[in-house]
Interface confidence: medium
């Protein structure tokens, strides 16, 4: 048993043009969090199993709001390690998927919205009990820098955490500095001591007394960066202190190949030899396959049978994004009829209907006149979610309850005089005019 530990150092726009300034905006503050998924090495069944070695979720990072015009700072990250406990043996070779998620804290109805910003994947060899390994991964325009290690939980020891070492109750026959080990009483376990002076940051050992270097470092104690270790470089001026030629700026300096790719110079530029699972000019494209289950929300993964070919997610209705991780703004499809107000609650869609309409999508036109009587012989007229009364002569108002003065509107043209009558109105026309309203 033991724990895999992952430390995220930075997440932000990668180098080069077209990189985004920030995953958040001034209008929409957000915060980041991470999810890691581990699968055992290269076994075939590992592809189907989700995070069979374990998985972990980081805390939320601090809320970040982009300041327009200000230089893009490092994005605030969640505190602490991501820890993935494992119960059985550490497999030595493992696959990982690290996802960076954005939580938008705007004014969405129904709470925050989530979207997948970046997903990186890789296969690595790692012995338990070794030092922190460092990595840089690129996903699209984003760059993720992190370190990881596997450590055994007592009493487990060894590179796979399979041997048990526990102190005996009986006096130890082991020499000073050695621990008695189960299951054999006479077996003594020496704490792993690397070669004296071996760099604790850039070197490690799997056998006592050795000093093996992490990528990018060399020398007997792993203290020399690879780019300055060679005196064979034909470029650049001579260094007075070492007598070596100080390398000038070569195309492979600083190793432009990401994700453990190795750089070799070509007559015009450089060439990256990418490890399995990565491709692109600088090995920056991560080879997530359909087996890693990259499509969310029931999206169908097509292609991507091996890490050298890309995958495409065909999203079900209501979802979009390269991984079907974004919910379509379903209100933009205007599902509410008859002028209803659409509310996307996240887990459901609601329509708030105008008066006179009902149903999940406001599709039912209620009988506006039901139970509505118009007084004094008026008739009810439906329309627009409200009822209206067409009143008999001499009556007015919403329900025809008010007596109306038929002459109030001056209906008699050309100076005719109006007289109210029980059957309506009568116009007495001025000389030279005629008609019911003196219109002729």
């Amino acid at each position: 048993a033991g724990v895999f530990e992952l430390q995220i150092h930075s997440f932000g726009p990668g180098p080069g043009p077209g990189a985004p300034r920030s995953p958040c905006s001034a209008r929409l503050p957000c915060r980041l969090f991470f999810r890691v998924c581990l699968k055992p090495g290269l076994s075939e069944e590992a592809a189907e199993s989700p995070c069979a070695l374990g998985a972990a979720l980081s805390a939320r990072g601090p809320v970040y709001t982009e300041q327009p015009g200000a230089p893009a700072p490092d994005l605030p990250l969640p505190d602490g390690l991501l820890q993935v406990p494992f119960r059985d043996a550490w497999p030595g070779t493992f696959s990982f998927i690290i996802e960076t998620w954005r939580e938008e804290l705007g004014d969405q109805i129904g709470g925050p919205a989530w979207s997948l910003l970046a997903r990186v994947a890789g296969r690595r060899r790692l012995a338990a009990g070794g030092p922190w390994a460092r990595d840089i991964q690129r996903a699209g325009a984003w760059e993720l820098r992190f370190s990881y290690r596997a450590r055994c939980e007592p009493p487990a020891v060894g590179t796979a955490c399979t041997r048990l070492c526990r102190p005996r109750s009986a006096p130890s026959r082991c020499g000073p500095g050695l621990r008695p080990c189960a299951p054999l009483e006479d077996e003594c376990e020496a704490p792993l001591v690397c070669r004296a002076g071996c760099s604790p940051e850039h070197g490690f050992c799997e056998q006592p007394g050795e000093c093996r270097c992490l990528e990018g470092w060399t020398g007997p104690l792993c203290t020399v960066p690879v780019s300055t270790s060679s005196c064979l470089s034909p470029r650049g001026p001579s260094s007075a202190t070492t007598g070596c030629l100080v390398p000038g700026p070569g195309p492979c300096d600083g190793n432009p190949c990401a994700n453990g790719g190795s750089c070799s110079e070509t007559p015009r530029s450089f060439e990256c030899t990418c490890p399995r699972g990565f491709y692109g000019l600088r090995c920056e494209v991560s080879g997530v396959t359909c087996a890693d289950g990259p499509c969310f929300n029931g999206g169908l993964c097509v292609g991507g049978a091996d890490p050298d070919s890309a995958y495409i997610c065909h999203c079900p209705p209501g979802f979009q994004g390269s991984n079907c991780e974004k919910r379509v703004d379903r209100c933009s499809l205007q599902p509410c009829r008859n002028g209803g107000l659409c509310l996307d609650l996240g887990h459901a869609l609601r329509c708030r209907c105008r008066a006179g309409f009902a149903g999940p999508r406001c599709e039912h036109d209620l009988d506006d006149c039901a139970g509505r009587a118009c007084a004094n012989g008026g008739t009810c007229v439906e329309g627009g979610g409200a009822h209206r009364c067409s009143c008999a002569l001499g009556f007015g108002g919403r329900d025809c309850r008010e007596r109306a003065d038929p002459c109030a509107a001056r209906p008699c043209a050309h100076g005719g005089r109006c007289y109210a009558h029980f059957s309506g109105l009568v116009c007495a026309c001025a000389p030279g005019y005629m008609g019911a309203r003196c219109e002729f």
């Epitope: 989700p50 069979a52 998985a55 969310f296 929300n297 029931g298 079900p316 887990h347 459901a348």
Partner: nanobody, 126 residues
């Protein structure tokens, strides 16, 4: 192997209570959104409750709101559904399910869920 195993179903009288459990093996529910669904004979499978991994938020369908409560114990890798004031119309096969997306979105659609249990029968007699 990935497995979700439901338990706790059975026969109960109307007004009674049951607590369903769903234990996961082969993966960690802490990083999965977990939901409870049910399917009555001759009817479509309907979502009744969900707990998201991102917000720790829970959603409950209107038909069971105030009576059913979803919860999870990540340390035990188990999802629960506490069902109170049961009614005969709650009779159905109950399933738990898991999906990688952090939110309980999608109109309770079962299509977004990747892993399913075999189900446990709940029968409420009047």
């Amino acid at each position: 192997e990935v497995q979700l195993a439901e338990s706790g179903g059975g026969l109960v009288q109307a007004g009674g209570s049951l607590r369903l459990s769903c234990t996961a093996s082969g993966f960690t529910i802490a990083v999965y959104t977990m939901g409870w669904f049910r399917q009555a004979p001759g009817k479509e499978r309907e979502g009744i409750s969900c707990t998201s991994w991102a917000g720790g938020r829970t959603y409950t369908a209107d038909s069971v709101k105030g009576r059913f409560t979803i919860s999870r114990d990540n340390a035990k890798n188990t999802l629960y559904l506490q069902m109170n004031s049961l009614k005969p119309e709650d009779t159905a096969m109950y399933y738990c399910a898991a999906k990688a997306h952090p939110d309980c979105s999608g109109d309770w659609s079962p299509s977004g869920y990747e892993y399913w249990g075999q189900g446990t029968q709940v029968t409420v007699s009047s």
